[in-house]
Each structure stands twice: as C-alpha cells, then as structure tokens.
Amino acid sequence: YDFTNCDFEKIKAAYLSTISKDLITYMSGTKSTEFNNTVSCSNRPHCLTEIQSLTFNPTAGCASLAKEMFAMKTKAALAIWCPGYSETQINATQAMKKRRKRKVTTNKCLEQVSQLQGLWRRFNRPLLKQQ
C-alpha cells in the first residue's frame, strides 16, 4: 500500500491521543534505553510503511502484535485516514485470524514495540532545523 495520500495530521492526532499511551502501557517496566534503534524511516509515508510492517507482520520471536490495543487503534487510524487502505488489508486480516495464538509478551516483542515507538516519534517530530 502507498501511504502517500494519507491524512498525516489526523493520524498524528490519533497517535498523540491514544496510540502513544497504549505503546507506553505495553512497554511498562522496560527502560527506554534498553533497546537500540534498529529501524528508521525517512519521511511520513515511509514511516507508515515501516510501522505497518512491524505492527502487523509476524517476525521471528514475536508471532503477532496485531491483537494488541495499540495495533487495533493503528489499524483503525490507517483505515480511516488512508484512502483505500481497508481494501488492501482484507486478505491479510483473514489470514491472521487463522494464525491466532495465545498472547505472550516476549523480549523480542518488547524490542519490536520499542522500535515502533521510535518510528512513531519520527513520524510525528517537527524538523527543528532545516540545515
């Protein structure tokens, strides 16, 4: 999906009002410096691409974050503020339902969510200096 035509300000507002808090809740008890940055993004569409990938694609050691509160709110924000996003996710959602497993918060998942926090911060940050 190409995130170029999303309403970035509306997504930013959704992040600031709820998603950020859910990410913090998930990471509670974890030091903010515990994980180094291993993923970055270079503009807002790129950030959303990487956020979608880390949030909804299973990875080794972290089978699925998609049922977490922050993930469901992320999905809702993208569905509302990114034209055509919902249609692209129907097949992925059906596949995900078949894979549903019990919820276990592994260290790998904590690391992944830490990376998500970093991506969201980059998505939202103002560029302080134009160089």
């Epitope: 970055s40 990487e50 302080l128 200096k129 134009q130 160089q131």
Partner: antibody, heavy 122, light 108 residues
C-alpha cells in the same frame, strides 16, 4: 548486535580500480542512509559519499566525484564503493557508517565499521 | 562550500571541564554532531543534534550550539577521554557532509 564490516581494501597502483564492500547486520539496513568516510594516515575525517535509504539518490565529495560510485543492495544488506582512477591521495582507512535521514537531510552517523585500509602506491 | 573550524588541541586537568569549539557561519541554524576517535579505532558518536546524547554515552558529555559556535563540553575529565574529537554537519545547500578538522584532547 548492530554491526558494519568493511572489506576489499588493499594495495593498488595509481590509475587502477578497487571495490570496497560493507556488510550490515543487526538492523533494518533498507531504512538507513549509508555513508563512506575516509581518513588518511595522521589526518582528520573526510566524508566521501552517501546513498539514500532506498538507493534512489547519491551525493559525493568533490574530491571523488566522477571517480567513485556508491551503491547498495538492500536485499543483501550490503553497501559498496567502486573506486576508479585511484590516486596516491586516496590512500586512507575507509569507514562505512549508517545514518538515519529525514527527507533530504542526513542525521548523525551512529554506527561505524572498523575500517579497511586502501593504499595507492606504485 | 561550508567550513567548520576547530582548535587543533585542547588540554584539561583530570576532574576539570574541557570545552571544544566548532566554528561555522551561522552554525546555530544547523544540527551539529560530535564524534570521539581514539587511536586505531573507528569514530564513536558522542553528541548528536547539538545536545542529544546516545544512550551509551555518559552524562559528562554535553553539547550546545548558537550563533557561529557549537561547543562540546566534557565535565570531570578522565584519562579515558583522551582522543580526537570531530564536529560534523549536513549542508543541505550543497548536499554534502562536512567535518571539522578535529581537536586532540589531552588530559594532563
């Protein structure tokens, strides 16, 4: 563990070519800008080139423009520097370094390789 | 092209504060990064975006930037701080990375 490992250095005659490589591991390579920086013996750091996270754009120092080419292969997590028409003044340790970027701005180089020595001598 | 000027050397007594400057035309409008390099080793980022510090760098390292001068401050200097220090910026007008000439810090 995040790591950059350079290879390909060696002794080469003036006018000849050399290709350096940098293998990345422990991070999502395709999301970072990547630089080459060199350091002549006993001298300071000199920036050489940078390639955008997706390989779409490159920028070069005037001293190497037209002679060096920076490329990346995101499927293999590798960065390359093709060095042609080498000169004695290209003798240096060559480092690769990663750098987050925002739009067209490259940020600090937060991870560096250990460097590979290139000696241009007849 | 943009030029960054650093003093070749700075000395500090153990436990005292060292300040390394980096001069450039209106450098305060740019983000400045600082690197430490010990002999035979690769550079290490110690301060980025003027004053931010990577999680692995001690709080003794700090930075500031305004006007025509950026400054790296190392408080409570230790023998292990002896190294070359380089400032760096990204010059958007020319799409180039610019490094300062480097400053050798000696802990007396």
């Amino acid at each position: 563990q995040m790591q950059l490992v350079e290879s390909g250095g060696g002794v080469v005659q003036p006018g000849r070519s050399l290709r350096l490589s940098c293998a990345a591991s422990g991070f999502t390579f395709r999301t970072y800008g990547m630089h080459w920086v060199r350091q002549a013996p006993g001298k300071g750091l000199e920036w050489v080139a940078v390639v955008w996270y997706d390989g779409s754009y490159t920028h070069y120092a005037d001293s190497v423009k037209g002679r060096f080419t920076i490329t990346r292969d995101n499927s293999k997590n590798t960065l390359n520097l093709q060095m042609n028409s080498l000169r004695a003044e290209d003798t240096a340790v060559y480092y690769c370094a990663r750098s987050p970027q925002w739009e067209e701005i490259f940020e600090a180089m937060d991870i560096w390789g250990q460097g590979t020595m290139v000696t241009v001598s007849s | 092209s943009y030029v960054l000027t650093q003093p070749p050397s700075v000395s500090v007594a153990p436990g005292q504060t060292a300040r390394i400057t980096c001069g450039g035309n209106n450098i305060g409008s740019k983000s400045v990064h600082w690197y430490q390099q010990k002999p035979g080793q690769a550079p290490v980022l110690v301060v980025y975006d003027d004053s931010d510090r990577p999680s692995w760098i001690p709080e003794r390292f700090s930075g500031s930037n305004s006007g025509n001068t950026a400054t790296l401050t190392i408080s409570r200097g230790e023998a292990g701080d002896e190294a070359d220090y380089y400032c760096q910026i990204w010059d958007s007008s020319s799409s180039l990375v610019v490094f300062g000439g480097g400053t050798k810090l000696t802990v007396l």
